[in-house]
Interface confidence: medium
């Protein structure tokens, strides 16, 4: 049954995980408009995502642009556009086969073949988690050098968005979700219940301490 | 409207120096970034350097490094190039451009206008 | 320092004819990052094309660019009269930003 609840547990934060990531995929604040001192450098506030970018002007006015060219946008937009795609596409795979195997569904018989199925799916959604952190991360990187950099003006200048919040968020809830599900599964058929739960109890604090790790708000 | 105005035509000793202003107007000059760019009369473009107003901070061409100085006085909204130890071949318009937004992927949904200046023709004869 | 070599150096046109201008670039450089500029006698430089495809505000729909890596392209469709000028490219991949040695295209 703990088994069967962690399995529970460990889709629900997957799926959630999962919708995180789409959201933060398709919202346009990965860059916001920087914030020096007590005032903000440009008139309006720019909202900057990975397919269009958005201006709200002072009056209150929002004028959103999708990025005209795809050849010409540049290498780190692109890469991050791809590994955003790639890891929703994965996450959906790693749903697929663990609904193959769930306890509660019939595709698969065997109880090792199910037991499997799932243990595949956790490590496919692990790398999910993993392709959602890179784009996130090195693009959190590229705003906090840009913001220390002297040849940026300033009105170039940006702060960490809500997307960027966001896809943190879908990595670690994916990671997380992940490895519950690897951890659910036996290595042996003979093992027990109490198996799962100890290789749960240690491996838990290495997967939760992962998204904490990223530093966040030492940039302004 | 942007604008960027240069000062006028000068006429140099080699050995000199020379001072083009270029002052700006239609926009907030701290937000943007202020290149140097100069052609020899019938030749190509060749870039000097840029500066961030905002900063201070500074990118020469290696070729006028230890000659060539940009500054800007925020106050006036006026960028300013030194150019020292002038010789015949440093005979050039000398323009100002305010660029495009650049480390930013905003750049690539609106339109990359950058603005010039005119021109400030700098002879150097002895 | 990033090298721009620009071909033809000079071209005479009729007009309504296609005009292909190239840059090669010296080591790989991404789209994002070369720009073209016209440039009229006694004018300063325009900028005409940005991020390799983009066309400036102004710039007529006969032009288009094209490209990647270390060799793009400027293409004029139609030429017409007002066309007559030098075109420059430019890098901003890597300081210093280099132009190229410009293409001056003349109507026949």
């Known amino acids: 049954m703990a088994s069967a609840g962690m399995q529970i547990l460990g889709v629900v934060l997957t799926l959630l995980g999962w919708v995180n990531g789409l959201v933060s995929c398709a919202l346009p604040m990965w860059k916001v408009t920087a914030f020096i001192g007590n005032s903000i450098v440009v008139a309006q506030v720019v909202w900057e995502g990975l397919w269009m970018s958005c201006v709200v002007q002072s009056t209150g006015q929002m004028q959103c642009k999708v990025y005209d060219s795809l050849l010409a946008l540049p290498q780190d937009l692109q890469a991050a556009r791809a590994l955003c795609v790639i890891a929703l596409l994965v996450a959906l795979f790693g749903l697929l086969v663990y609904l193959a195997g769930a306890k509660c569904t019939t595709c698969v018989e065997e109880k090792d073949s199910k037991a499997r199925l799932v243990l595949t799916s956790g490590i496919v959604f692990v790398i999910s988690g993993v392709l959602t952190l890179i784009p996130v991360c090195w693009t959190a990187h590229a705003i906090i050098r840009d913001f220390y950099n002297p040849l940026v003006a300033e009105a170039q200048k940006r702060e960490l968005g809500a997307s960027l919040y966001l896809g943190w968020a879908a990595s670690g809830l994916l990671l997380l979700g992940g490895g519950l599900l690897c951890c659910t599964c036996p290595s042996g058929g003979s093992q027990g219940p109490s198996h799962y739960m100890a290789r749960y109890s240690t491996s838990a604090p290495a997967i939760s301490r992962g998204p904490s790790e990223y530093p966040t708000k030492n940039y302004v | 409207q942007v604008q960027l105005v240069q000062s006028g035509a000068e006429v140099k000793k080699p050995g000199a120096s020379v001072k083009v202003s270029c002052k700006a107007s239609g926009y907030t000059f701290t937000n943007y970034l202020i290149e140097w760019v100069r052609q020899a009369p019938g030749q190509g473009l060749e870039w000097m350097g840029l500066?961030?107003?905002?900063?201070?901070?500074?990118n020469y061409n290696e070729k006028f490094k230890g000659r060539v100085t940009m500054t800007t006085d925020t106050s006036t909204s006026t960028a300013y190039m030194e150019l020292r130890s002038l010789r015949s071949d440093d005979t050039a318009v000398y323009y100002c451009?305010?660029?495009?937004?650049?480390?930013?992927?905003?750049?690539?949904?609106?339109?990359?206008?950058?603005?010039w200046g005119q021109g400030t023709l700098v002879t150097v004869s002895s | 320092e990033i090298v721009l070599t620009q071909s033809p150096d000079f071209q005479s046109v009729t007009p309504k004819e296609k005009v292909t201008i190239t840059c090669s670039v010296s080591?790989?450089?991404?789209?994002?990052?070369l720009h073209w500029y016209q440039q009229k006698p006694d004018q300063s430089p325009k900028l005409w094309i940005y991020g390799t495809s983009n066309l400036a505000s102004g710039v007529p729909s006969r032009f288009s660019g094209s490209g990647s890596g270390t060799d793009f392209t400027l293409t004029i469709n139609s030429l017409e009269a007002e066309d007559a000028a030098t075109y420059y490219c430019?890098?901003?991949?890597?300081?210093?930003?280099?132009f190229g040695g410009g293409t001056k295209v003349e109507i026949k």
């Open positions: 080591s790989s450089i991404s789209s994002s990052n």
């Open positions: 430019q890098q901003w991949s890597s300081y210093p930003h280099t």
């Open positions: 500066i961030n107003p905002g900063s201070g901070g500074t």
């Open positions: 451009a305010r660029r495009s937004p650049l480390g930013s992927w905003i750049y690539y949904a609106y339109d990359g206008v950058a603005y």
